[in-house]
Each structure stands twice: as structure tokens, then as C-alpha cells.
């Protein structure tokens, strides 16, 4: 199933394991999405030479993919759990438009691409519950997202392949950093 089981968020351990604790659901969800990304990267790397390309910078100029920085408080040095959790949620919300772009980019892994997208939506919900006491999270502007999507889809084939590769790579790195940070929370 695309989404691991679980019901209401619960931070204090209960005597029974249903529902899952929020920490366990978040951890499992991220690992599930990472597995999906690996499968998608495999298809991308098999059908093009993008994974070995040295021309990534050309395509990266057109993208504004979320990236963890020191100021976000998600690294061991300068760790700040509240700042970090806001960054993780904001970053995932920003990735949503790029995950939408990926939806028609795969042939044999079409279902996997959909599963990654839907599982990310569920992960955002889990994290928003965990962050219920934090300041409001800024959501991306739908109009800006729509125009970005149109722009990405209008690229030539080479740039679309490179964009797909870069989205998957960046999303993987973002999730790995998020997973490490969330384990402390």
C-alpha cells in the first residue's frame, strides 16, 4: 500500500501499538517515499545519461528546489527543532509542484510516481499535526505554482529529463536530512 497504516497522532506511548505513534508514522512514511524515489531514479538513470551528466548547472538555473541550509536549523550544528520542523513542512509544500511535474514523466513507474506524490501529501499532514503549536506555515502561491508547472512542461526534452533527475536527487537529499533531524524530535 502507498501509505503505511496509522490513525491519530499520539506522542505519549500507549500500551497498544494501534494507532501508531506519530514519530513512527513519520519515520516509516519518509522511508517509504525514499524507496519510491530510488525506484524512480533507477528508471531515469536507465533511460538517459542524466545521472552522469556534468551539465546539471544549466538546468538548475531554471529550478528553485528546496534545500536545507545551516540557517534552517536542521543540521547537528546549530540545530533548532522548531525552525527545522517549519523548514521541513515548508520545503515539502514547495516540492509538491515538482512532484506534480513528475507525474507524466515515467512509463514503467507511473504508479510509483503517483505513490510518491500521494505519500508526500500524507507526510505533510503528519508533520502539520506534530507542528500544531508552531507558527503558521507559509503555503506556496497556487498561481505561481501553475505558471512554474507550465514553464517546466514547455522545456525541451533534454531539459525535461535533466529537471526530472534534479527533482528526484534534491527531494532525496531533502528527505534524508529531514529524516535525520526528525529522529531527534
Amino acid at each position: 500500500a502507498p501509505v503505511p497504516p496509522g490513525e491519530d497522532s499520539k506522542d505519549v506511548a500507549a500500551p497498544h501499538r494501534q494507532p501508531l505513534t506519530s514519530s513512527e508514522r513519520i519515520d516509516k512514511q519518509i522511508r517509504y517515499i525514499l524507496d519510491g524515489i530510488s525506484a524512480l531514479r533507477k528508471e531515469t538513470c536507465n533511460k538517459s545519461n542524466m545521472c552522469e551528466s556534468s551539465k546539471e548547472a544549466l538546468a538548475e538555473n531554471n529550478l528553485n528546489l528546496p534545500k536545507m541550509a545551516e540557517k534552517d536549523g536542521c543540521f547537528q550544528s546549530g540545530f533548532n527543532e522548531e525552525t527545522c520542523l517549519v523548514k521541513i513542512i515548508t520545503g515539502l509544500l514547495e516540492f509538491e509542484v515538482y512532484l506534480e511535474y513528475l507525474q507524466n514523466r515515467f512509463e514503467s513507474s507511473e504508479e510509483q510516481a503517483r505513490a510518491v506524490q500521494m505519500s508526500t501529501k500524507v507526510l505533510i499532514q503528519f508533520l502539520q499535526k506534530k507542528a500544531k503549536n508552531l507558527d503558521a506555515i507559509t503555503t506556496p502561491d497556487p498561481t505561481t505554482n501553475a505558471s512554474l508547472l507550465t514553464k517546466l512542461q514547455a522545456q525541451n526534452q533534454w531539459l525535461q529529463d535533466m529537471t526530472t533527475h534534479l527533482i528526484l536527487r534534491s527531494f532525496k537529499e531533502f528527505l534524508q536530512s529531514s529524516l535525520r533531524a526528525l529522529r531527534q524530535m
Epitope: 506522542d11 505519549v12 506511548a13 501499538r17 501508531l20 505513534t21 514519530s23 513512527e24 508514522r25 519515520d27 516509516k28 547537528q76 550544528s77 546549530g78 540545530f79 533548532n80 527543532e81 522548531e82 506534530k130 503549536n133 529524516l179 535525520r180 533531524a181 529522529r183 531527534q184 524530535m185
Partner: antibody, heavy 119, light 106 residues
């Protein structure tokens, strides 16, 4: 040298309270989640509670929920466990433990402090 | 909560022999850890996330397994390895520990 030193243990009557402390040294304390784990005499290990690096999230075992409170003071590099409504079955050596950054493993442990609940 | 059962309770072996310790979980676990504890001392992390060797731990220690069945192997026992070994799991809170396996000198 990376070190955790517990203190505050002692003899207390059933229903009484005790506050344990754990002083961290040799590493930057603030990025690490911390836990308390206990070991009853001649028995195995039992996880008690965890606190996130900034103290925003706490987790407790079912046996201590509502009676024990975990807290920390990052400015003092210290972890605490406030234990109320103590019972005979809370008698144990209490260890504080650091969570390995980026993992759930408890990688550094103190030498423990003994809590005895008896009348 | 997840129950961990360790076997055997006691393992009597001689230095140089191979030790195989088992840990069985009541349901599938996300992460498994192994600790060594000597009398009067705090537990020491040996293995994390099923098979990763903790910092400063000799390569004769190794961990394996997934799901519900896990194994700690000590390839060739050294005199300092005689101690009690605990498995611990995390699959959400609470963390739980096995009852321990005592490795004693035969």
C-alpha cells in the same frame, strides 16, 4: 571526554518525590535528544522517557506517564527527571543516555544513580 | 508494546569461540540495537540500525536480521567479551529491551 553524570538518587518513601539530574560534558549538548533508562536490581533495562533537543517534544513509557516529567536546561548542559508518586517498583538504577544524532540509538550513557523506594 | 525475547538466557563458551545471540520480536520492528553490559557498568552500544558497528567497537561484533528475527555474532570471543548482551528496538515509543543473554566463560 564525552561524559554524562547522574545525581539526585537516594532513599525515598512510597508516594514521595525525587528529582534526578544529569550533567553533560565533552560535547555540545543542545542538538541531542536525551533519554532516561532504568534498571531494577538484578533485572533488565527499561526505557523511561525522552526529550527532544529543544524540549518541545517529550515521550514517556506507560509505566511512568503522569508521574514522571523529563526536562532539560541547555544553558546548563543538564537533563532532569522529576519523579512524583513514587512506588516500590520504581526502585532502580537510573541512567541518562544521549541519542546518536540522526538515529534512534542511545549511544552515550552515564554511570547511573540509584533510587530506592521503601518505607 | 513490542516484546523482545532473547535466547539463550545464558551462553557458556570459551575464549576464541564464536557466539551467536538471538533476539526475536513479537511483531516486525523498524530498528534494532545491541548493547553490552558488564557488572556495575552502564550499557555500551555495539550495533545500531540492525547491522552498523558503533564507534570504537571491534569488528568481531556484527549484527544481522530484519523483521522479527535478529542476531548478534561475536566471531571470536575475547576475555573482555564475557558480559550480558541486550537487544533494544525502536518502532515508535516506547523503546523496548530484551531480557538479556549472559555470555559466560565455560
Amino acid at each position: 571526554e564525552v561524559q554524562l553524570v547522574e545525581s539526585g538518587g537516594g532513599l525515598v518513601q512510597p508516594g514521595g518525590s525525587l528529582r534526578l539530574s544529569c550533567a553533560a560534558s565533552g560535547f555540545t549538548f543542545s542538538p541531542f535528544a536525551m533519554s532516561w533508562v532504568r534498571q531494577a536490581p538484578g533485572k533488565g533495562l527499561e526505557w523511561v522517557a525522552k526529550i527532544s533537543p529543544g524540549g518541545s517534544w517529550t515521550y514517556y513509557s506507560d509505566t511512568v506517564t503522569g508521574r514522571f516529567t523529563i526536562s532539560r536546561d541547555n544553558a546548563k548542559n543538564s537533563l532532569y527527571l522529576q519523579m512524583n508518586s513514587l512506588r516500590a517498583e520504581d526502585t532502580a538504577v537510573y541512567y541518562c543516555a544521549r541519542q546518536l544524532w540522526g538515529y534512534y540509538a542511545l549511544d552515550i550513557w552515564g554511570q547511573g544513580t540509584t533510587v530506592t523506594v521503601s518505607s | 508494546e513490542i516484546v523482545l525475547t532473547q535466547s539463550p538466557a545464558t551462553l557458556s563458551l570459551s575464549p576464541g569461540e564464536r557466539a551467536t545471540l538471538s533476539c526475536s520480536a513479537s511483531i516486525s520492528v523498524s530498528y534494532m540495537y545491541w548493547y553490552q553490559q558488564k557488572p556495575g557498568q552502564a550499557p555500551r552500544l555495539l550495533i545500531y540500525d540492525m547491522s552498523n558497528l558503533a564507534s570504537g567497537i571491534p569488528a568481531r561484533f556484527s549484527g544481522s536480521g530484519s523483521g522479527t528475527d535478529f542476531t548478534l555474532t561475536i566471531s571470536s570471543l575475547e576475555p573482555e567479551d564475557f558480559a550480558v548482551y541486550y537487544c533494544m528496538q525502536w518502532s515508535g515509543y516506547p523503546y523496548t529491551f530484551g531480557g538479556g543473554t549472559k555470555v559466560e566463560i565455560k
